[in-house]
């Protein structure tokens, strides 16, 4: 008789999840000398321990503390790039601008990027069939709690000028319900962070509007200002040219507005 299994609304754990996490850890620690001391088996054990045998709607930040401890990493606090709904361009940017870091350029972010995982209460099995959806099932699921935890820590570590890349093609350029809007914004430390600089990325080729005047950007400015943090905003009209100019700043076409 097959054992009854909870059916959740979201996709199940990414196939070969344990192998993927372990392989990513090994690769990352090989590439980043400052993380060579990390024992990837211990990292996987701590990761697994955060959600295995636990109800996938009752996960807490405390469950991830052993993993957070093992993945402790120092990134230059003044070189942090946050992003919202525009992950690919943010990652392309930090691949070129090597001295800047998104969360996914850190070990923990790199391990979990684009993966899904969950377990089941009282069994050591990983659920490959379905996992809780944030909206339809519950917010305290393994994936959401992980990203909330690492995002909070990442924002708390930031200092000086913090940059955020925002998608100007979205109806809500700044979305209060995104991870950036609900977690990172509220965990920037005014004692350390002087300015939040938003880069609003335009989608259309002929889009010359000043999206920094968008009502949601004004709302972001007001929230940030109330934290005694300065706010600035730049339109990136041509993201393709923007990346090209990051690669080749000497290019003659890079002196004009991007």
């Amino acid at each position: 008789v097959p054992r009854w299994r909870q059916q959740w609304s979201g996709p199940g754990t990414t196939k070969r999840f344990p192998e993927t996490v372990l392989a990513r850890c090994v690769k990352y620690t090989e590439i980043h000398p400052e993380m060579r001391h990390v024992d990837c088996q211990s990292v996987w054990d701590a990761f697994k321990g955060a959600f295995i045998s636990k109800h996938p709607c009752n996960i807490t930040e405390e469950d991830y503390q052993p993993l957070m401890k093992l993945g402790t990493q120092t990134v230059p606090c003044n070189k942090i790039l946050l992003w919202s709904r525009i992950k690919d361009l943010a990652h392309q940017f930090t691949q070129v601008q090597r001295d800047m870091f998104t969360l996914e350029d850190t070990l923990l972010g790199y391990l979990a990027d684009d993966l899904t995982w969950c377990g089941e209460f009282n069994t050591s099995k990983i659920n490959y069939q379905s996992c809780p959806d944030w909206r339809k099932d519950c917010s305290n699921n393994p994936v959401s709690v992980f990203w909330k935890t690492v995002s909070r820590r990442f924002a708390e570590a930031a200092c000086d000028v913090v940059h955020v890349m925002l998608n100007g093609s979205r109806s809500k350029i700044f979305d209060k319900n995104s991870t950036f809007g609900s977690v990172e914004v509220h965990n920037l430390q005014p004692e350390k962070v002087q300015t939040l600089e938003a880069w609003v990325i335009h989608g259309g080729r002929e889009d010359s509007r000043d999206l920094c005047q968008d009502p949601t950007i004004k709302e972001l400015e007001s929230i940030i200002s109330k934290r005694n943090i300065q706010f600035s905003c730049k339109n990136i009209y041509r993201p393709d040219k923007f990346l090209q100019c990051v690669k080749n700043p000497e290019d003659s076409s890079c002196t004009s507005e991007i």
Epitope: S182, H186, E219, S225, N228, I229, F231
Partner: antibody, heavy 114, light 108 residues
Framework: VKESEGGLFKPTDTLTLTCTVS????????VIWVRQAPGKGLEYIGF???????YYANWAKSRSTITRNTNENTVTLKMTSLTAADTATYFC???????????WGPGTLVTVSS | DMTQTPASVSEPVGGTVTIKCQAS??????LSWYQQKLGQPPKLLIY???TLASGVSSRFKGSGSGTEYTLTISGVECADAATYYC????????????FGGGTEVVVK
């Protein structure tokens, strides 16, 4: 944090109050203006942020202007077209930790009467 | 924007007073509480919904998240007789008032 003297004003007059701050920089902390009519509750007027951007309560937008002078450590509230309903004690307040109003001036009484 | 209840409460010395504050939308725990005595400016008691301001008695306790917040005064003393206000510290724009209407606390 200290507000300049208020006093007696006539309807349609323009109110100008100056807040002088010491012990902290206007580049590090925003400043809020709040008022309180006699026997009534606290009412937010507006605020000048560390970057110099100003924000106002919806009711105050059309006739209030907040400016700052970082060199002189002063913040000024200007309110036009006064009516008797603007009679209140006006407070200048530091926008402190987590956006709370942590340091209050003693307040200054403004009376609008013909 | 901020609905505060009750408008007035009377409590004997040693009792417990509970004041509630509701925001029209989530303010992400950016809520502070103030005590105001007659003829004085308000005094900050609690910020970030639950953090006690410097020098404030631990008899004052703040709690809540999202849109619902509570100030609890336990072991009420005569010196607690005052008007208490909540304030949302989330944003200073597009608001009518950032303060609640106030609660008068009478100590019997």
């Amino acid at each position: 944090v200290k507000e300049s003297e208020g006093g007696l004003f006539k309807p349609t007059d323009t109110l100008t109050l100056t807040c002088t701050v010491s012990g902290f920089s206007l580049s590090s902390y925003g400043v809020i203006w709040v008022r309180q009519a006699p026997g009534k509750g606290l009412e937010y007027i507006g605020f000048v942020a560390v970057g110099g951007t100003t924000y106002y309560a919806n009711w105050a937008k059309s006739r209030s202007t907040i400016t700052r002078n970082t060199n002189e450590n002063t913040v000024t509230l200007k309110m036009t077209s006064l009516t008797a309903a603007d009679t209140a004690t006006y407070f200048c307040v530091r926008n402190g930790v987590s956006g709370s109003s942590d340091i209050w001036g003693p307040g200054t009484l403004v009376t609008v009467s013909s | 924007d901020m609905t505060q209840t009750p408008a007035s409460v009377s409590e004997p010395v040693g009792g417990t007073v509970t004041i509630k504050c509701q925001a029209s939308q989530s303010i992400y725990s950016y809520l502070s509480w103030y005590q105001q005595k007659l003829g004085q400016p308000p005094k900050l008691l609690i910020y970030s919904a639950s953090t006690l301001a410097s020098g404030v008695s631990s008899r004052f306790k703040g709690s809540g998240s999202g849109t619902e917040y509570t100030l609890t005064i336990s072991g009420v003393e005569c010196a607690d007789a005052a008007t208490y206000y909540c304030q949302q510290d989330y944003s200073g724009s597009n608001v009518d008032n950032t303060f609640g209407g106030g609660t008068e606390v009478v100590v019997k």
